[in-house]
């Protein structure tokens, strides 16, 4: 196309996480996906100065087609601010990431005491459960509901029936996954909810109960048997 255009970000979701706390010896990847016409070039700065290969043992890789900077086996001296500068003849844009290299002993995820907290609401109301997770290693977080199947909470193997309500995915930020919203609550929503956080060391989880009360001035509804999920 002949439409000349200054550089612009094409995928800001991939750039939302500015602070990267990474264990020593791990690989770090910073991305700045961009577009423009003519196609912009990308260069990287460390702490505001040109980032050269000789600035770190083992150098680094730049994947221009992926708009990425890759550093393998990071060490404490890699800590700092990394800025991508994307430019063409019509303009320049930049984005800065902060890298912290973690050397302390990684541990199981720690969940804040008292969270999620038990909650109660009336039928038709809204409720939210909050889970605060602290983890040296990147945690994977899930919200789980303990459900019934054929009137039983447990299967023939003695294990509980569970349904994953929400899990951290490619398009989910850490902040989004820390809160579970339940809108327009029904009696079937009552029960035990678990926030599970895991990392390479292990899994930790906290549970809370949701109590559902009849709406004021209404008889308690007689509900049909719900459709149970495996």
């Amino acid at each position: 196309s002949n439409n000349k255009r200054a550089p612009y970000w094409t995928n800001t979701e991939k750039m939302e996480k500015r602070l990267h706390a990474v264990p020593a010896a791990n690989t770090v990847k910073f991305r700045c996906p961009a577009g423009g016409n003519p196609m912009p070039t990308m260069r990287w700065l460390k702490n505001g100065k040109e980032f050269k290969q000789e600035h770190r043992i083992g150098g680094y890789k730049v994947r221009n087609q992926h708009w990425s900077l890759i550093m393998e086996s990071v060490v404490p001296s890699d800590k700092g601010n990394y800025t991508c500068v994307v430019e063409n003849e019509y303009g320049s844009i930049n984005h800065t990431y902060h890298l912290d290299v973690v050397e302390r002993s990684p541990h199981r995820p720690i969940l804040q005491a008292g969270l999620p907290a038990n909650a109660s609401t009336v039928v038709g109301g809204d409720v939210e459960f909050v889970c605060k997770v602290y983890s040296d290693a990147q945690p994977h977080i899930q919200w789980i509901k303990h459900v019934e199947k054929n009137g039983s909470k447990y299967g023939p193997d003695g294990l509980p029936y569970l349904k994953v309500l929400k899990a951290a995915g490619v398009n989910t930020t850490d902040k989004e996954i820390e809160v579970l919203y339940i809108r327009n609550v029904t009696f079937e929503d009552a029960g035990e909810y678990t926030c599970l956080a895991g990392n390479s060391i292990g899994i930790s989880f906290h549970s809370a109960w949701l109590t559902v009360l009849p709406a004021p001035g209404r008889e308690k509804e007689i509900t049909a048997s719900p459709d149970y999920l495996e």
């Epitope: 990147q138 292990g202 899994i203």
Partner: antibody, heavy 124, light 112 residues
Framework: EVQLLESGGGVVQPGRSLRLSCAAS????????MHWVRQAPGKGLEWVAV????????YYADSVKGRFTISRDNSKNTLSLQMNSLRVEDTAIYYC?????????????????WGQGTMVTVSS | DIVMTQTPLSLSVTPGQPASISCTSS???????????LYWYLQKPGQPPQLLIY???NRFSGVPDRFSGSGSRTDFTLKISRVEAEDVGVYYC?????????FGGGTKVEIK
Amino acid sequence: EVQLLESGGGVVQPGRSLRLSCAASGFTFSSYAMHWVRQAPGKGLEWVAVISYDGSNKYYADSVKGRFTISRDNSKNTLSLQMNSLRVEDTAIYYCVRGAGRGYTYGPDGFDIWGQGTMVTVSS
Amino acid sequence: DIVMTQTPLSLSVTPGQPASISCTSSRSLLHSDGKTYLYWYLQKPGQPPQLLIYELSNRFSGVPDRFSGSGSRTDFTLKISRVEAEDVGVYYCMQYIEAPLTFGGGTKVEIK
């Protein structure tokens, strides 16, 4: 049946390299962290390294940091340990151990399944 | 690093008699989720370690009920109510709360 099978052990001279492999079967390998643990002849157990289920996080014992690299290929259900600059004190049986899974668990969250081990001897 | 210390170093037991192994950790293994991440293993000659007890006191599947784990925070005990010939080997405690994961030095149990 859940199984871990190590291979790649052998006799090697100090300063040389060796690559160990662990083939996993009977469970969803890509959903579990994996560990290496070693045991010197007649001695106790020493944890060596761990890798997260997707390979994004790795941790090492101080005794092997900078020399050993843990990696995984989830498409092949394989865990590896690249051992460089080997020392006499690295002589041991190396065990592959299943770590924590990604989901809710009733029972231990890892360190329940061990391979039979592969012997590495570093000697001049 | 968390240091795990096991006593005694070895134990000679008459079949049918009880046995007790102690393990202490240099830091508390009680996690914020209320669980204590202390594991016990038995390693029989020529075999890899096998899990006996996880999270302080839970018996792993297939482990006989003569094995029990107890303790709190930093002091732990593995008890065998009635030792059998098949129980010989080296017993290890392990902390599973943070890396590096660490093991006790082991307790060798043999039959008199």
